[in-house]
Interface confidence: low
């Protein structure tokens, strides 16, 4: 009831609580001398459903039929109107549509750890939208029963608070849970179960992994567990990976011996357990423990390679580059690599550790036969050694590929293509790749990088270390046994319009004909492969068009003659250069006026 | 590491709402149960409203804040959100959020604490008549 209802009273029947789809009869009446003042004939009520007018009558009551009301609480509200006044609230009543529960399925009860409370979970079915009561009840051995209750409307989840005892583990409990509200009331099937069936282990705790002799390959993996355990699952992933090793285990106890661990590796390993073999339920997985394995001596052999330098008539550079071990090859932390450089003849051999360094640079006299030896080295060892033998790789001409075309791929990728050397081309025991960046000045500095291809290989795509706009200095080895033959070729993988022309720097008359001298264009300003250079003239003050020389573009080249000026004329001189995208723009301008005599 | 932290709290008039947020940092929860409970002053922390982490996301509330709150998350931005209409005193408290790594599909199991293995800080809420 709404209010304190002093004027009049609102009935509902058959009850305040009725099943969707029922009709109810509302009746409103005024209690005595509680109508419009001197007109009582001219009382007006007027019954609300919220805040809708649904039907209205003149007299001490009001009757009124409702159907159709949706599921909840609906409020009906009777109201008095007078002449010339505002209309006041009589009295009110609040109706409950529902449905009577349904079954309660799906019933199941779980113990969480052998010390743990029973707890029992179901599904309610179809919301009732009325007040409902449900009532959990457990039977066991010996006539015990308990039971609990909630008056949640929402209630799904009941502990019980009890804890089963494994004294008896094939006792039967039963549970059963009923629903109540003022439409009915319906309970679930029971559920039957022992202790075995329903006590779900606490997860395995203190989890530890002992390594010994710092050996991958003596590996145990400790933990606890209560008391009951008779199963675990052990599951065991590099840190890095999405996929589980999985390993079941019976009687345990605690411990169990991993033999498949990979060396110097981040795992992570976690541990569930089971009362009995087909009854019940694993616990959740434990936490994880996360353990580096112990490293082991390297495997697999290094990829060196090498340029020489000629210094003088008696001296060469050696410069040696290798890569990186792959993880699973250097099975630990390389500490250092350790270089071997021997003369063959004389037997003379140097060695030294290089740290911190994937290359070394030395001098050796340019007689004799050199070999180097190159191994990597971690706390347990050292890989077996790369051993290479000195050679001149561009020595014999028959070797050299043929055709060598490098061309775009993509973004950031160039493809390298070849034709077998005109020599016997099953010789070729494999192909090397090798490229850097192009500078000017032939630096020593600039990284090198390299791959090796089968001899059955004519292309390869270069990817590593290549950025746009850059020229490459490309060039393909054929070797066979001690011998080798090399072509190059220049390449990038995008490119455009130089930024800038050539800056000529001098002019310098010889005999009759003069020599034209430039900067190099910046590196990051050549826009990739430099193609041409264009050098123009024309004679100052005047209107013709330019004239121009094209000189093929070659790294070393900082000069050129032009011999078709006239004497005595002053003439404007600039330079532009020329990618497979286009010409850049003008360089400074220079004026020249040639002294010589005339023809 | 994991961390969940709330903001969005204040003192506000009867009547009035907040919004509460909270961000998920370490870990993404998007397709897990998360929760806001909220503990008064010498009251055990009392759970508000959840969602269930499973597909479409079903949201539990307390009988108490039916109807007035309105629990939701954006599972790309990793956040959670609690908006809160019509504010009463009753409502004062500091309010949690919890997440937990795995999905609760029942609404007995959403609303206990031991459910969530994350807790944040607390934002406070202060309502005044």
């Known amino acids: 009831k709404i209010d304190a209802c002093k004027r009049g009273d609102v009935t509902v029947k058959p009850s305040h609580v009725i099943l969707l789809g029922s009709t109810v009869n509302i009746t409103c009446s005024l209690k005595p001398r509680q109508g419009c003042f001197h007109y009582s004939r001219r009382n007006k009520l007027i019954l609300y459903k919220f805040d809708r007018r649904i039907n209205f009558h003149h007299g001490h009551s009001l009757n009124s039929q409702v159907t159709g009301l949706p599921l909840g609480t609906t409020l009906f509200v009777c109201k008095l109107a007078c002449i010339n006044s505002d209309e006041i609230q009589i009295c009110g009543a609040e109706i409950f549509v529902g449905v009577a529960p349904e079954q309660p399925q799906n019933l199941s009860c779980i113990q969480k750890g052998e010390q743990g409370t029973v707890a029992c979970t179901w599904e309610r079915g179809r919301d009732t939208h009325l007040y409902t009561e449900y009532t959990l009840q457990l039977s066991g051995p010996k006539n015990l029963t308990w039971q609990k209750q909630c008056k949640d409307i929402y209630c799904d989840y009941l502990d019980f608070g009890i804890n089963l005892t494994p004294e008896s583990p094939e006792s039967n409990f039963t549970a059963k849970v009923t629903a109540v509200n003022s439409l009915g009331s319906s309970s679930s099937l029971p559920s039957t179960f022992t202790f075995l069936d329903i006590v779900r282990p606490l997860p395995p705790w203190d989890i530890r992994i002992k390594f010994q002799k710092a050996s991958v390959s003596r590996c145990t993996l400790y933990w606890r567990d209560e008391g009951l355990v008779l199963l675990n699952r052990l599951r065991y992933r590099p840190s890095n990976s999405r996929l589980w090793n999985m390993v079941n285990v019976t009687k345990a106890k605690g411990r169990h011996d991993l033999l498949d661990l990979k060396p110097f590796t981040e795992y992570e390993f976690q541990i569930s357990s089971k009362l009995h073999l087909y009854k019940g339920s694993w616990s959740d997985w434990s936490e994880s423990l996360r353990a580096q394995t112990p490293e082991e001596e390297p495997t697999g052999m290094l990829d060196v390679w090498y340029m020489k330098r000629h210094i003088d008539y008696s001296r060469q550079q050696i410069s040696l580059f290798w890569k990186n071990l792959s993880v699973s090859e250097a099975r630990g932390k390389i500490l250092h690599y350790q270089v071997t450089l021997q003369e063959l003849t004389g037997g003379k051999a140097m060695t030294q550790n290089i740290t911190g360094h994937t290359s070394w640079t030395t001098v050796i006299p340019r007689t004799g036969n050199w070999a180097v030896a190159v191994s990597a080295a971690n706390s347990k060892g050292s890989s077996l050694p790369t051993r290479i033998n000195i050679m001149n790789l561009c020595e014999a001409g028959l070797l050299a590929p043929r055709q060598v075309s490098a061309n775009s791929e993509g973004m950031d990728n160039i493809l390298v293509t070849w034709q077998p050397p005109r020599k016997d081309p099953s010789a070729v025991q494999e192909y090397v790749v090798e490229w850097r960046e192009l500078h000017p000045g032939g630096d020593t500095q600039v990284p090198l990088n390299w791959l090796r291809s089968r001899p059955y290989n004519v292309s390869a795509l270069i990817s590593e270390n290549i950025k746009s706009y850059i020229c490459y200095e490309i060039r393909v080895y054929a070797l066979s046994g001690d011998q080798g033959g090399c072509s190059s070729i220049l390449g990038n993988s995008k490119h455009k319009a130089p930024l800038s022309g050539p800056h000529i720097n001098a002019i310098t008359e010889e005999k009759g004909s003069i020599l034209i001298s430039w900067n190099s264009i910046p590196v990051q300003e050549q826009m990739g492969c430099l193609l041409h250079y264009r050098i123009y003239w024309k004679e100052r003050d005047s209107n013709s068009q330019p004239q121009l020389c094209e000189i093929p573009y070659r790294v070393s080249q900082n000069s050129h003659p032009i011999n078709s000026l006239q004497p005595r004329v002053t003439y404007v001189l600039w330079m532009t250069a020329l990618t497979a995208a286009g010409e850049s723009s003008h360089g400074n301008e220079r004026e020249f006026c040639l002294q010589g005599k005339a023809n | 590491q994991v961390q969940l932290q709330e903001s969005g709290g204040g003192l506000v008039q009867a009547g009035g709402s907040l919004r509460l947020s909270c961000a998920a940092s370490?870990?993404?929860?998007?397709?897990?149960?998360m929760a806001w409970f909220r503990q008064a002053p010498g009251t055990e922390r009392e759970f508000v409203a959840g969602?269930?982490?499973?597909?479409?996301?079903?949201?539990f509330y307390d009988n108490s804040v039916m109807g007035r709150f309105t629990i939701s998350r954006d599972s790309a931005k990793n956040t959670m959100w609690l908006q809160i209409n019509n504010l009463k005193p009753e409502d004062t408290a500091v309010y949690y959020c919890?997440?937990?790594?795995?999905?609760?599909?029942?609404?007995?199991?959403?609303?206990?604490?031991?459910?969530?293995?994350?807790w944040g800080q607390g934002t406070q809420v202060t309502v005044s008549s």
């Open positions: 969602l269930s982490g499973s597909g479409g996301d079903t949201a």
């Open positions: 919890a997440a937990a790594t795995h999905v609760v599909v029942s609404y007995g199991l959403v609303r206990r604490r031991g459910t969530y293995d994350y």
């Open positions: 370490g870990r993404t929860f998007s397709n897990y149960a």
